[in-house]
């Protein structure tokens, strides 16, 4: 039930990558507007995106307060131009989102290889430690700061001249691998959180190859 010509939101979906978190829903509004509320399981509701005609709401600022909490959001529908109006039960029409726990569910963004340096038959490959919007003591935390050893990186590497790949793992942001002298190699990395059951892996980083500008070579 609800006010005439007002429909409840549906398909409420969390879209979250490296903790940047947006709630999306349907339908596109016709003669209605939306307001979103978010809370933790034990907390109070906080209103966001007041009387909007958008079908998304950026909730990053709320979820980064504690990424290990479980959040619930709800989307209220109001008739356009009459936002005081309520449904037949005396309150606006609303729909609940699925629960969302950022630490367990945010997608891992595509990583980037920051640099690689060859010294003789060793190559040190460094993965960029991406900054998130999670704050501690007024500074933004990196992905590694947030996940610690829960986050590992997998490196794929191969000789430019062949297709056979090798792989290595690190729970820091650096790899030190053995290579054949005089051979050029290509590299790609993937972020993984082994303890997760969903959204466990990122997509692979762009491929970087030796002989291109990110690398450095020393005898």
């Amino acid at each position: 039930s609800g006010t005439t010509n007002t429909v409840a939101a549906y398909n409420l979906t969390w879209k979250s990558t490296n903790f940047k978190t947006i709630l999306e829903w349907e339908p596109k509004p016709v003669n209605q507007v939306y307001t979103v509320q978010i809370s933790t399981k034990s907390g109070d509701w906080k209103s966001k995106c007041f009387y909007t005609t958008d079908t998304e709401c950026d909730l990053t600022d709320e979820i980064v307060k504690d990424v290990k909490q479980t959040y619930l959001a709800r989307v209220f529908s109001y008739p356009a131009g009459n936002v005081e109006s309520t449904g037949s039960a005396g309150e606006p029409l609303y729909e609940n989102s699925p629960e969302f726990t950022p630490y367990l569910e945010t997608n891992l963004g595509q990583p980037t290889i920051q640099s690689f340096e060859q010294v003789g038959t060793k190559v040190n490959v460094t993965v960029e430690d991406e900054r998130t919007l999670v704050r501690r003591n007024n500074t933004f935390l990196s992905l590694r700061d947030v996940f610690g050893k829960d986050l590992i990186y997998t490196l794929y590497y191969w000789k430019s001249s062949s297709s056979g790949k090798k792989t290595a793992k690190t729970n820091t942001n650096e790899f030190l691998i053995d290579v054949d002298k005089g051979e050029n190699y290509c590299f790609s990395v993937q972020a993984v959180i082994p303890s997760r059951t969903v959204n466990r892996k990122s997509t692979d980083s762009p491929v970087e190859c030796m002989g291109q500008e990110k690398g450095e070579f020393r005898e």
Epitope: Y156, K166, P194, N199, R200, K201
Partner: antibody, heavy 117, light 107 residues
């Protein structure tokens, strides 16, 4: 319930090929890495290779690089191992396993491949 | 490739005994070391991962220690169901390599 079921084993002529299947249920293989192992009768475990089904990356033990191909059909939630130019020493039980990136938490029951004329 | 040298290859022990199995890597494997138990005709089962972490559902009599190149699996008080073959596995870099196995038999 997570399950891995291998199939496709049996008797193969020397020089022949095999294609083993590993049908997964209870989880999406795209979220994990899928590996193939083998164990010759009375011998230790031997790693063949792995696939990341989502990205398509494959890694092989160099000793199998030229004869083994690991693939996956995500729509069927199934991983495959194709091995060519089989010889008697390839006789083994072949296992598939799910890798969390920390450890192998589930294995199939294994499928026996016998290479003999 | 990283070589894994496991010892002993077999041992005889009695129920209640403390059993120790060691694995040495040919170079630092940064604790990417798992221990597996295998019984005849069965698939391997993980006991310990990241050298020291007990896998879910594994009894606390199993423990792992070590770092760098040297790692140990300890069974504090051997139970009848523990008679099996144990393998160490390094998964820090490809190819994944295993020890030769340790068969734990009843004395």
């Amino acid at each position: 319930e997570v399950q891995l079921v291998e199939s496709g084993g049996g008797l193969v002529q020397p020089g022949g090929s095999l294609r083993l299947s590993c049908a997964a249920s209870g989880f999406n293989i795209k979220e994990y890495y899928m590996h193939w192992w083998r164990q010759a009768p009375g011998k230790g475990l031997e790693w063949v290779g792995l696939i990341d089904p989502e990205q398509g990356n494959t890694i092989y033990d160099p000793k199998f690089q030229d004869r083994a191909t690991i693939s996956a059909d995500n729509s069927k939630n199934t991983a495959y191992l194709q091995m060519n130019s089989l010889r008697a020493e390839d006789t083994a039980v072949y296992y598939c396993a799910r890798d969390t990136a920390a450890y192998f938490d589930y294995h199939g029951q294994g499928t026996l491949v016998t290479v003999s004329s | 490739d990283i070589q894994m040298t496991q010892s002993p290859s077999s041992l005889s022990a009695s129920v209640g005994d403390r059993v120790t199995i060691t694995c040495r890597a040919s170079r630092d494997i940064k604790s990417y070391l798992n221990w597996y138990q295998q019984k005849p005709g069965k698939a391997p089962k993980v006991l310990i991962y990241y050298a020291t972490s007990l896998a879910e559902g594994v009894p606390s009599r199993f423990s792992g220690s070590g770092s760098g190149t040297d790692y140990t699996l300890t069974i504090s008080s051997l139970q009848p169901e523990d008679f099996a073959t144990y393998y160490c596995l390094q998964h820090g870099e490809s190819p994944w390599t295993l020890g030769q196995g340790t068969k734990v038999e009843i004395k």
